[in-house]
């Protein structure tokens, strides 16, 4: 969470940004809020990126002004016009690229004053893992698969019954490059599993942490997955 103040004469407005992460190939949001102003046509929103000449996006007089937009962002940005009324200047970024990572500035000017705040935007790939019982294996085993990760994550297994146990000796993890030659498919197999136990497959890089849980009993298999972005404001 980054709060910035701006001064215009005697007036300053608070602008707040949140560090966030973009999943490459998907759409992302760079979050920014400001003190709402009743005079709507006086609101100017500018998004800038460190090291880039020109603007990422500009919104003024109630509409987008893309005359100074840098070509790397052409056709990929939008603000939520209706949300500007309530002080939301967040930027929608379509088809996130690895090169979109960096420091962005959300600059706001209203009839009350001006202000800005920076945010760090991380880009990578992250996806939910799915755990299945691998019946093909010679012994009972679990297979944890996640289709898209970047940078290369670490994978660890845990068990409810054997808490604190190190499963690295009884698991095998592989990373397979996907067709776009950036992201990778993560596959990890855990051998010698026992029934009536809950196992967790944890995949983590510097952007996200994902966990898949599976509980295997005589009568059923229960699964649960969750994904958490790291260092998000």
């Amino acid at each position: 969470l980054i709060i910035g103040f701006g001064i215009s004469g005697k007036h300053f407005i608070t602008v707040t940004t949140f560090t966030s992460a973009g999943n490459i190939g998907e759409d992302g949001t760079l979050s920014c809020t400001f003190e709402p102003d009743i005079k709507l046509n006086g609101i100017v929103i500018q998004w800038l990126k460190e090291g880039i000449k020109g603007l990422v996006h500009e919104f003024k007089e109630g509409k987008d002004d893309l005359s100074q937009q840098h070509e790397m962002f052409r056709g990929r940005t939008a603000v939520f016009a209706d949300q500007v009324v309530v002080g939301n200047a967040s930027l929608r970024l379509k088809n996130v690229q690895l090169t979109d990572a960096g420091t962005y500035t959300c600059y706001i000017r209203t009839s009350k004053g001006k202000g800005n705040a920076n945010l760090e935007y991380k880009t990578g790939a992250f996806s939910m893992p799915e755990i299945n019982v691998d019946y093909n294996a010679s012994s009972e085993s679990l297979r944890c698969e996640a289709p898209r990760w970047f940078p290369q994550p670490t994978v660890a297994w845990a068990s409810q019954v054997d808490q604190g146990a190190n499963f690295s000796e009884v698991s095998n993890t592989s990373f397979e490059l996907n067709s776009e030659n950036v992201t990778m498919k993560v596959v990890s197999v855990l051998y010698n599993v026992t029934i009536n136990n809950t196992y967790s497959c944890m995949i983590e890089n510097d952007i996200a942490k994902a966990t898949g849980d599976i509980k295997v009993t005589d009568s059923e298999v229960k699964r649960r997955s969750q994904l958490q972005l790291l260092n998000s404001g």
Epitope: L40, V84, V85, V86, G87
Partner: antibody, heavy 116, light 107 residues
């Protein structure tokens, strides 16, 4: 000085429609949103809908979805609110107001009575 | 949809005394909160926006405070013209929701 002047009181039959106007003067009409807020007798304030001429968009409260239509005529600085399929519970004073996000100037109110 | 609640429903205070009116939001509205005063037969009047910023022409005996979900409007020394209904309103999200109001009456 900003002024919002609304049309006069109306008596309507259940099932019919009402249309209230709100003429703004004293500031740039399209610089601001115009909202409609109603107040039933002895009750509190209820935001119904808002129009943002500069954005060309409108928002309705879910409760009035499909029944309320708001429009704005920039050339005459006038906003309109139409409410259809009126019922007795729609009897209220209807205010036009400048805003959101908050509301700094209000019209004098238009009393609409729905009665058979 | 954000739900706004106000307490008390009615507050009886003597002129010259201090009055504190409470407003609560069902989820955080940050600082996107306004207060209005309404006298019988009149349109509401904006008192405060942004939690604590007084609107043009509002006397400094009216003070707003709070953040997130809990807010208070304090009138430091009540004048006879201050009696009436008071409403809070959130503008963090559409739709804009008013609280049910607090009626401030003369004791």
């Amino acid at each position: 000085q900003v002024q919002l002047v609304q049309s006069g009181a109306e008596v309507k039959k259940p099932g019919s429609s009402m249309k209230v106007s709100c003429k703004a003067s004293g500031d740039t009409f399209s610089s601001y949103a115009i909202s409609w807020v109603r107040q039933a007798p002895g009750q509190g304030l209820e935001w119904m809908a808002g129009i943002i001429p500069v954005f060309g968009t409108a928002h309705n409260a879910q409760k009035f979805q499909g029944r309320v239509t708001i429009t704005a005529d920039k050339s005459t600085s006038t906003a309109y609110m139409e409410l259809s399929s009126l019922r007795s519970e729609d009897t209220a004073v209807y205010y036009c107001t400048r805003g959101g996000p908050y509301f700094d100037y209000w019209g004098q109110g238009t009393l609409v009575t729905v009665s058979s | 949809e954000i739900v706004m609640t106000q307490s008390p429903a009615t507050l009886s205070v003597s002129p010259g005394e201090r009055a504190a009116l409470s407003c609560r939001a069902s989820q955080s509205v940050s600082s996107n909160l306004a207060w209005y005063q309404q006298k019988p037969g009149q349109a509401p009047r904006l008192l405060i926006y942004g939690v604590s910023t007084r609107a043009t022409g509002i006397p400094d005996r009216f003070n707003g405070s709070g953040s997130g979900t809990e807010f208070t409007l304090t009138i430091s020394s009540l004048q006879s013209e201050d009696f009436g209904a008071y409403y809070c309103q959130q503008y963090k999200k559409w739709p804009f929701i008013f609280g049910p109001g607090t009626k401030l009456e003369i004791k």
